[in-house]
Amino acid sequence: IWELKKDVYVVELDWYPDAPGEMVVLTCDTPEEDGITWTLDQSSEVLGSGKTLTIQVKEFGDAGQYTCHKGGEVLSHSLLLLHKKEDGIWSTDILKDQKEPKNKTFLRCEAKNYSGRFTCWWLTTISTDLTFSVKSSRGSSDPQGVTCGAATLSAERVRGDNKEYEYSVECQEDSACPAAEESLPIEVMVDAVHKLKYENYTSSFFIRDIIKPDPPKNLQLKPLKNSRQVEVSWEYPDTWSTPHSYFSLTFCVQVQGKSKREKKDRVFTDKTSATVICRKNASISVRAQDRYYSSSWSEWASVPCS
Amino acid sequence: VPGGSSPAWTQCQQLSQKLCTLAWSAHPLVGHMDLREEGDEETTNDVPHIQCGDGCDPQGLRDNSQFCLQRIHQGLIFYEKLLGSDIFTGEPSLLPDSPVGQLHASLLGLSQLLQPEGHHWETQQIPSLSPSQPWQRLLLRFKILRSLQAFVAVAARVFAHGAATLSP
């Protein structure tokens, strides 16, 4: 058993049929010694008396808010949550496996630049009685500070018969060094509580591996005289790290016909312009990627040819 | 470069950008099996990193690029030695046309651009690379190349910025 926060405790249980469970001793937080009784949740049934209560925690029915009283007055509470371990593996019932980039990916994180700011998100089908708490650090043995805000519900989607809820959190490394080569990964830890079930999820990454620039901005076309060619120009996104002579991007320019089956023409360039042939009813799209490190491409910025 | 002269920024930029491309094409190396054998290896803990105080940020480069260039040089020599060690020359064998061969040569090429014959910077002591057990080599290659990708990315940024702003 360990303390998650004040008066909230997590009991770690091996979860299998007829498991013996864990013996837990609760102590009433009071100077009183006599006349103390214990109850669980809303029930008025007295579970025991005395300053301590010993219980055998085996299942969710044994978890909940234990309260010690004296003469009708509440003295203190202890909320017991369960953390299940099945076949040596902690349960992951609360969050949905996003399966990207690999199986057992529950948390996904992205950064728009090298400033040390990043966003993580996760999915669940649970709509009520759900709380999240997020902590983060750079490295684990001698952790350096990363400050995370509160997790908020950022999107709701309907998937077949199910509703899916996306939560996200923003974090900022306290002393970020954008130009340095990271040697210690960022660690993100999410505590999830659904009713009386506790689970924790972690992710470990370097900022460089979760970079995804915003799409290029101010995408413009300039027809070239007496030609089907056009000059496409764009700019670095505002959110990208500066100076651009140091934090450089590379770009992919794509000409795509109306039909998805039509052949796509692609050009790669380090410049912020390119000359392409603009076909009728086609559109021109540009996306960006860090020039020197193959992290994610940005989403496309697009303009129609006409 | 040693003693304060300026490197051939544009040449360094071109070669460092080539190094980035090679480092990504060399990884993941197609081994004979999946990287099933996990386990942390000392070899990758000792790699030199370009850290915050090394002056490789735009301001540091403007003030005095020597500190940064020396750190980059140390790293290039370190990785060049790693790529020639048993980790990469032993079994499972890399094919003759593996990008690792080119990567190895390019690391040497860039380090020589930074430190021509006759000049000597204090080079960091290369840890003695005791031959890893053969079964550890694939995982080590994987880790070393991942680490090298990050190192050469920072080096390439440095040379790109230098070529754009510090070239005579």
């Epitope: - | 004979h32 099996m33 099933r36 054998e37 030695k81 020639g84 060690s85 048993d86 020359t89 032993g90 079994e91 499972p92 064998s93 890399l94 003759p96 061969g101 690379l129 031959p131 057990q133 053969p134 079964w135």
Partner: antibody
Framework: EVQLQQSGPELVKPGASVKMSCKAS????????IHWVKQKPGQGLEWIGY????????KYNEKFKGKATLTSDKSSSTAYMELSSLTSEDSAVYYC????????WGQGTTLTVSS | DIVMTQSPATLSVTPGDRVSLSCRAS??????LYWYQQKSHESPRLLIK???QSISGIPSRFTGSGSGSDFTLSIDSVEPDDVGVFFC?????????FGGGTKLEIK
């Protein structure tokens, strides 16, 4: 074509030393290890050790430490093995071979130790 | 050291037979196992690498299987030219060790 060409047979007296060579051609000498293997007449194979021609790093079978010394010369793409304090137990065919999974083997050097 | 044990020591077969040669390691070597054939007065020749990977130029009738500590070299339809001694080798950890060999004879 890849070839490992080994030096010719040796007949030496007990207590003496011998140095045999293995010249590589057809590939970049520093790209792969050179292993040495011992085979006594009508018997199995024993790994002696290897040298990495890139950095002259060596790895020995404990059994052959003090007996075998592996060296290489990049300029001539040649690996060498010196055997010291020879006894009749050292009479065998000695093979040089590049990485096991490449199947480059020398033709063997026959060593006879006899007074 | 990892001990490699081969069986049988000698195998006498008729051309066209399918034969299996066994190799056992004293501890797990994953799939870091090599098979060699050595004909009389010749250097060993690699037949199989990493337990089951074929080698170009080696007839397809030679196949390898196994992982961990038990390995098999199979010869689909033995030919008179297949005579020789077959060795297995641990390529997993130092020192590299060889099996004692299986001698293949044609009746």
């Amino acid at each position: 074509e890849v070839q490992l060409q080994q030096s010719g047979p040796e007949l030496v007296k007990p207590g003496a030393s011998v140095k045999m060579s293995c010249k590589a051609s057809g590939y970049t000498f520093t790209r792969y290890l050179i292993h040495w293997v011992k085979q006594k007449p009508g018997q199995g194979l024993e790994w002696i050790g290897y040298i990495n021609p890139y950095n002259d790093g060596t790895k020995y079978n404990e059994k052959f430490k003090g007996k075998a010394t592996l060296t290489s010369d990049k300029s001539s793409s040649t690996a060498y093995m010196e055997l010291s304090s020879l006894t009749s137990e050292d009479s065998a065919v000695y093979y040089c071979t590049s990485n096991w999974d490449l199947d480059y083997w020398g033709q063997g050097t026959t060593l006879t130790v006899s007074s | 050291d990892i001990v490699m044990t081969q069986s049988p020591a000698t195998l006498s077969v008729t051309p066209g037979d399918r034969v299996s040669l066994s190799c056992r390691a004293s501890q797990s070597i994953s799939d870091y196992l090599y098979w060699y054939q050595q004909k009389s007065h010749e250097s060993p020749r690699l037949l199989i690498k990493f337990a089951s990977q074929s080698i170009s130029g080696i007839p397809s009738r030679f196949t390898g299987s196994g992982s961990g500590s038990d390995f098999t070299l199979s010869i689909d339809s033995v030919e008179p030219d297949d005579v020789g001694v077959f060795f297995c080798q641990n390529g997993h950890s130092f020192p590299f060790t060889f099996g004692g060999g299986t001698k293949l004879e044609i009746k």
